[in-house]
């Protein structure tokens, strides 16, 4: 038996983090996003649940909806109608999948100071929203869309085809929600509130994933979800637009699919209203390297939507898949014809392009060996976007303004020099025409949210600076965080290293690799975090490293598309390369190296443990994918193609965790999964376990009954992190 080693942070009155701190969320931070209601007015929900109105210019603020009104219906969220006459209050939140939930809605009349009675909304509602003008309501109930011209009016039923687990109107099915739209809704109002566009998803032919939900009853329930795995039948999508002024006169009108898309299996990817009678739809071939953006116009004479061929713009990737994780969406100019869009330039870096007529004639707006990440707002004279250009760090985000009114356009970094040490990772929230905006800084220092003048970029006010958190961290020994790069051959890998307090390079420390590594992800980010790995470094003296290997995002397509059609190879190889480099640094105890990951990270950590290199003593996989055939079609096929003999079946088979079962013999492996995981099905871990048993390989396992992919219920989460901590400490011979 190896003697136990205890890490003792020396000579300091500050205390180390405890696991309890992490599990209690003691050191969580706050952000402040204004809910803009005009150019200079916004709403915000206060700590004590009052809804407060603010006018930046007059400095007025007052409560528009008291917490007692909120409490009277147990409301947790709200939404003001654009005409400001009504507020919906949301209560009985009941989570479904990642974004979707059902809720009960009440409408409050601000003038009368009472709830609207008569024709009350049904419950539970799957989605509800105001029109962009006035106070029309659209909502989805039992997979059908309904419309109310006013909150007190009777509802008008727009669709009748809705059926549980078969046909979804205005809300996505499981796979579209998770892998394509990343929203709980699939309906969009036109800017003037005249038209309502929506998607119908037909899941009638999709195979069902069924799993037990144990609950408290004598018999478990079975959860059934239409879930297309790789190569399976996919949802059939149709897009409709209905005139909400006269919904009973003319029914919903279908928007035609571009010919080059409709010729084989395809996806709808997004919808953007351009003007009151112009809409932009994006489509994607099932083989996701061709995307088509189609601009359609309302033809009053035909009472139809026309999408001329000369308004189709094709985006194609020759080295991988179209877009990043998703295909980017267009940001239209005020002429309602030209638009700005992020896609790969000739060097394979994602940059902003200006499209006036054809994609071929696109004008490149940004360029360089860095990537434009998101276009926030296009106004008459400015375009605001985020990128990782500044100082060449891919894991930073700064906000830039391009003055498009000027010729040539001039570029200014709005955030680069504001709080240089504290803030290197920003997002922003703009008022309608960017007269004002809020900046939300996520780190690396304590997060801070500030309000700015959109003309001068002057800071007007600090909205949230996390003073309480700053005070409570004063007596905590936090680890030191470094973000650096390492080179291997012609490749550069960025890594984040979390070093124990009083780190001494002349000593040896255990190393834990935390990995995600999924295509188009990024783990090495300049953000603030106090989480489980922070505790492991602070209290247990473990060095933590996160490495962004090939396949990760924002470093160009050569790096991103390296993993195309061969998942599970380079992601693992690059983690191993990094570990070898870390050993060369001289402060890592080679006998005590572990790896852990969740989801895609569980897949990579499993394959790394089974790499046969002898680098790892132990590792943990939480909710891992074990075969790409078990995962969702849209995701798996985007990166792997189809699991068919004439496409990529061979690599689908080669890249499973089960194929490497024998190689787990010389490592300590902890396998963890929630039994009610709707996303990465328990099947994945069941198959790993079966393969390990068949190979007579010993391993440890833990399941979490009725927990989903997040294993997020309080008790389960506590148990999970406590269990993983014990496992790691045992592996590293650290006493409890």
């Amino acid at each position: 038996l190896r003697p136990s080693r205890v890490y003792k942070p020396e000579g300091n009155t500050k205390r180390a983090l405890t696991l309890k701190d992490i599990l209690n969320g003691t050191f969580s931070y706050k952000t402040y996003f204004p809910n803009w209601i005009s150019e200079q007015e916004y709403l915000h929900q206060s700590e004590d649940d009052n809804i407060v109105f603010y006018n930046i210019e007059t400095r007025e603020s007052y409560i528009i909806l008291s917490n007692s009104t909120m409490k009277s219906v147990n409301a947790t969220d709200y939404g003001l109608s654009p005409d400001r006459q009504f507020v919906y209050l949301e209560s009985d939140y009941s989570k479904l999948w990642r974004y979707s939930y059902t809720a009960t809605y009440y409408i409050y009349d601000l003038q009368n100071g009472e709830f609207v009675r008569g024709y009350e909304l049904p419950r539970p509602i799957q989605y509800l929203c105001w029109s962009p003008v006035g106070s029309k309501l659209a909502y989805v109930y039992q997979n059908n869309i309904y419309l109310k011209q006013r909150p007190g009016d009777p509802p008008f039923q727009i669709t009748y085809t809705g059926r549980e687990n078969r046909i979804f109107n205005g809300i996505p099915d499981w796979v579209y929600e998770e892998e394509m739209l990343a929203t709980k809704y699939a309906l969009w109002w036109s800017p003037d509130g005249k038209f309502l566009a929506y998607v119908e998803f037909n899941d009638s032919d999709i195979p069902i994933i069924a799993y037990s939900y144990y609950g408290d009853g004598q018999y478990p329930r079975t959860i059934n979800i239409p879930y297309p795995k790789a190569g399976a039948k996919n949802p059939v999508v149709r897009v409709f637009i209905v005139d909400t002024t006269y919904p009973h006169h003319v029914g919903p009108m279908e928007v035609p699919v571009p010919e080059m898309i409709a010729s084989s299996d395809y996806y709808f990817s997004w919808l953007t209203w351009v003007s009151s009678e112009r809409v932009c739809l994006q489509w994607l071939k099932r083989v996701q390297n061709v995307s088509v953006l189609s601009i359609c116009d309302f033809r009053e004479d035909w009472h139809a939507w026309e999408c001329p061929k000369n308004q189709e713009h094709v985006e194609e990737s020759r080295t991988g898949w179209a877009g990043g994780f998703f295909v980017s969406t267009p940001a239209f100019s005020q002429d309602a014809t030209s638009y700005y869009k992020i896609f790969s330039d000739k060097d394979g870096y994602k940059h902003i392009h200006y499209i006036k007529d054809t994609v071929e004639n696109a004008i490149q707006i940004t360029s360089g060996k860095w990537e434009a990440i998101y276009i926030f707002r296009v106004t008459q004279d400015s375009l605001f976007y985020s990128s990782n250009e500044f100082e060449g760090y891919p894991g930073r985000r700064n906000i830039y303004r391009i003055s498009i009114g000027n010729s040539p356009p001039s570029k200014k970094c709005v955030t680069c020099h504001l709080r240089k040490e504290r803030c290197q990772y920003y997002t922003a929230s703009f008022s309608y025409k960017a007269k004002y905006y809020a900046l939300v800084c996520y780190g690396p220092g304590l997060p801070i949210s500030t309000l700015h003048d959109g003309r001068t970029d002057q800071e007007i006010q600090v909205l949230e600076e996390n003073k309480e958190l700053e005070n409570s961290l004063r007596n905590i020994q936090l680890p030191k965080v470094e973000i650096k790069k390492l080179k291997d051959g012609g490749l550069t890998f960025w890594y984040k290293m979390i070093l124990p307090p009083q780190f001494d390079r002349s000593k040896k420390y255990p190393l834990l690799i935390q990995v995600y590594g999924g295509p188009c992800s990024q783990s090495v980010k300049s953000v603030f975090a106090v989480n489980w790995i922070t505790y492991l470094a602070s209290k247990e003296g473990i060095v933590i490293a996160l490495v962004d290997g090939r396949g990760t995002a924002f470093q160009g397509d050569k790096f991103l598309h390296a993993v195309y059609r061969k998942l599970g190879v380079y992601e693992v190889e690059d983690q191993l390369t990094a570990v070898r480099k870390f050993i060369e640094m001289g402060f890592i105890d080679e006998e005590r190296i572990a790896i852990w990951g969740w989801s895609y990270g569980g897949y990579v950590s499993s394959l790394a443990l089974a790499s046969g290199t002898g680098l790892f003593k132990c590792g943990i996989a939480v909710a891992p994918v074990s075969s790409w055939e078990y995962y969702a079609s849209i995701y798996s096929e985007r990166f792997m193609g189809l699991p068919t003999k004439d496409d990529n079946l061979e690599h689908y088979k080669n890249s499973t965790v089960m194929a490497r079962a024998e190689y787990f013999r010389n490592v300590d492996y902890l396998l963890i999964h929630g039994t009610a995981d709707d996303n990465v099905h328990f099947q994945n871990s069941a198959q790993i376990a079966k393969a390990l048993v068949n190979a007579q390989v010993d391993f440890q396992a833990m399941w979490y009954s009725d927990q989903n992919h997040g294993i997020s219920s309080g008790r389960s989460q506590n148990h999970l992190y406590t269990h993983m901590t014990h496992f790691l400490k045992q592996c590293f011979s650290l006493s409890d």
């Epitope: 005009s38 150019e39 200079q40 007015e41 109105f53 006018n55 210019e57 007059t58 007025e60 528009i64 003001l80 400001r84 006459q85 009349d109 601000l110 003038q111 100071g113 025409k433 007269k435």
Partner: nanobody
Framework: DVQLVESGGGLVQVGGSLRLSCVAS????????MSWVRQAPGKGLEWVAS????????YYADSVRGRFTISRDNAKNTLYLQMNSLKSEDTAVYYC?????????VNQGTQVTVSS
């Protein structure tokens, strides 16, 4: 001291037109979302129309949409309501309000009477 002075009301035939004005003082008019509201005899306050501070966006009650137009001149600190195709149910005292949201606080107003 905040002051809102409405004018332009009067007696008009069904189908006729009127233009109401509201002159503001004592506050930075150009920074405020402004509204017109009305009170018919024996009824509560009813919202009519609103306009953004920069005049860019306007909202109307269903009962007046297409007939009334709200506008503003920030240089003159004045809010307007152009009322066309007037109906007898438009008879009310009309007030302008600087409250960004209901409930509205109103002053003296201007009487509009639509007779058939």
């Amino acid at each position: 001291d905040v002051q809102l002075v409405e004018s332009g009301g009067g007696l008009v035939q069904v189908g006729g037109s009127l233009r109401l004005s509201c002159v503001a003082s004592g506050f930075t008019f150009s920074s405020y979302y402004m509204s017109w509201v009305r009170q018919a005899p024996g009824k509560g306050l009813e919202w009519v129309a609103s306009i953004y501070a920069d005049g860019d966006m306007t909202y109307y009650a269903d009962s007046v949409r297409g007939r009334f137009t709200i506008s503003r001149d920030n240089a003159k600190n004045t809010l307007y309501l152009q009322m066309n195709s007037l109906k007898s149910e438009d008879t009310a005292v009309y007030y302008c309000a600087k409250d960004p949201l209901p409930p509205y606080h109103v002053n003296q107003g201007t009487q509009v009477t639509v007779s058939s």
